[in-house]
């Protein structure tokens, strides 16, 4: 069964997937695909890495973490309802039938319609990737939501805190993680 992750329309969705390289820079090919993991590789590939670099990606799909350290978590930008479904993260560990595959279910909820001051909308446009933080649990998505009482200084401070947060480390306890070597 798949672990479930949630995001709202217009947000960035985050699907965690990690492995620990056997040695620094000793990378393993990884693919992300839309649809459950098949026998080989990924179906409907949206992003792919080889032993050196990201060698294929499609618009709105990117690796936000340090994939050279094994953080191959997928970020999907500005999600729509059509992005709902199963995603496959496959870590293609060398050897006979060694690779690891993880099916992650993404549930997209309609955006909450809440009137907001113009300045918040400007903030959203200026810092779109900071609006979604990563929760401690696999099905958790934290958002700033409506911020009518926060002034621009507070917003700037909050944005910096979000940017500097290390919640991704917490996700290693609940996301798809595999140690190699």
């Amino acid at each position: 069964s798949e672990v479930e992750y949630r995001a709202e329309v217009g947000q960035n969705a985050y699907l965690p997937c990690f492995y620990t390289p056997a040695a620094p820079g000793n990378l393993v090919p990884v693919c992300w695909g839309k649809g459950a993991c098949p026998v080989f590789e990924c179906g409907n590939v949206v992003l792919r890495t080889d032993e050196r670099d990201v060698n294929y990606w499609t618009s709105r799909y990117w690796l936000n973490g340090d994939f050279r350290k094994g953080d191959v978590s997928l970020t999907i930008e500005n999600v729509t309802l059509a992005d709902s479904g199963i995603y496959c993260c496959r870590i293609q560990i060398p050897g006979i039938m060694n690779d690891e595959k993880f099916n992650l279910k993404l549930v997209i909820k309609p955006a909450k319609v809440t009137p907001a001051p113009t300045r918040q909308r400007d903030f959203t446009a200026a810092f779109p990737r900071m609006l979604t933080t990563r929760g401690h649990g696999p099905a958790e998505t934290q958002t700033l939501g409506s911020l009518p009482d926060i002034n621009l200084t507070q917003i700037s401070t909050l944005a910096n805190e979000l940017r500097d947060s290390r919640l991704a480390n917490d996700l290693r306890d609940s996301g798809a993680t595999i140690r190699i070597g």
């Epitope: 459950a36 098949p38 080989f40 990924c42 032993e51 293609q92 560990i93 060398p94 690779d99």
Partner: antibody, heavy 125, light 108 residues
Framework: EVHLVESGGGLVKPGGSLKLSCAAS????????MHWVRQAPEKGLDWIAY?????????????YYADTVKGRFTISRDNAKNTLFLQMTSLRSEDTAMYYC?????????????WGQGTSVTVSS | QIVLTQSPAIMSASPGKKVTLTCSAS???????LYWYQQKPGSSPKLWIY???NLASGVPARFSGSGSGTSYSLTISSMEAEDAASYFC?????????FGGGTKLEIK
């Protein structure tokens, strides 16, 4: 144009060995996973092995085998020479078949999208 | 392993007739990973339909594919002589990947 050409087939006695090759051209071989599939005379298709791209070195490939050939057959590739191999040992009469190599579409849409013309293997005393 | 059973094993159809070939799986197969191949005598298999219903490049529009779960089919809306061939369904949804036994389609 994608081109796959198998070679190395022939007549071999039970218990014997044979090494098949598949020469690839018309595409970036190191980007693609590859399969071996066989077809016994007047029979259906039988998948036997797969090797992932291993684009930087063939040591980095992920490999899958059918249970019927596990421990007897070895799939490998030489990306520098654009060639896929199938080393077959401890051959049995039931291994008699036409052996095809096939390319696996890494985008995950077309599966085994191109096949070679095949090389015939006959295991008989 | 998933066993794919194709029926009929052999069938003949007159030109212009509608033809339906079926592929039944012993357990559920993701429609994304159910494929069909065409093979003519003396030739290697050719990808014909991918992801249940998508026609491969060069396949005539009279062909179509459908299905889900354990039941899939390939349909020819109007049989033509060049369609005489063997057709194999194939799944790579779960290990090991398997093929159906094939349907040999002949022209009357």
């Amino acid at each position: 144009e994608v081109h796959l050409v198998e070679s190395g087939g022939g007549l071999v006695k039970p218990g014997g060995s044979l090494k098949l090759s598949c020469a690839a051209s018309g595409f970036t071989f190191s980007d693609y996973g590859m399969h071996w599939v066989r077809q016994a005379p007047e029979k259906g298709l039988d998948w036997i092995a797969y090797i992932s791209s291993g684009s930087i070195s063939s040591d980095s490939s992920t490999i899958y085998y059918a249970d019927t050939v596990k421990g007897r057959f070895t799939i490998s590739r030489d990306n520098a020479k654009n060639t896929l191999f199938l080393q077959m040992t401890s051959l049995r009469s039931e291994d008699t078949a036409m052996y095809y190599c096939a390319r696996h579409d890494w985008r995950g849409l077309y599966g085994m999208d191109y096949w070679g013309q095949g090389t015939s293997v006959t295991v008989s005393s | 392993q998933i066993v794919l059973t194709q029926s009929p094993a052999i069938m003949s159809a007159s030109p212009g007739k509608k033809v339906t070939l079926t592929c039944s799986a012993s357990s559920s197969v993701s429609s994304s990973y159910l494929y069909w191949y065409q093979q003519k005598p003396g030739s290697s298999p050719k990808l014909w339909i991918y992801s249940t219903s998508n026609l491969a490049s060069g396949v005539p529009a009279r062909f179509s594919g459908s299905g889900s779960g354990t039941s899939y089919s390939l349909t020819i809306s109007s049989m033509e002589a060049e369609d005489a061939a063997s057709y194999f369904c194939h799944q790579w949804s779960s290990y090991p990947p398997t093929f159906g036994g094939g349907t040999k389609l002949e022209i009357k």
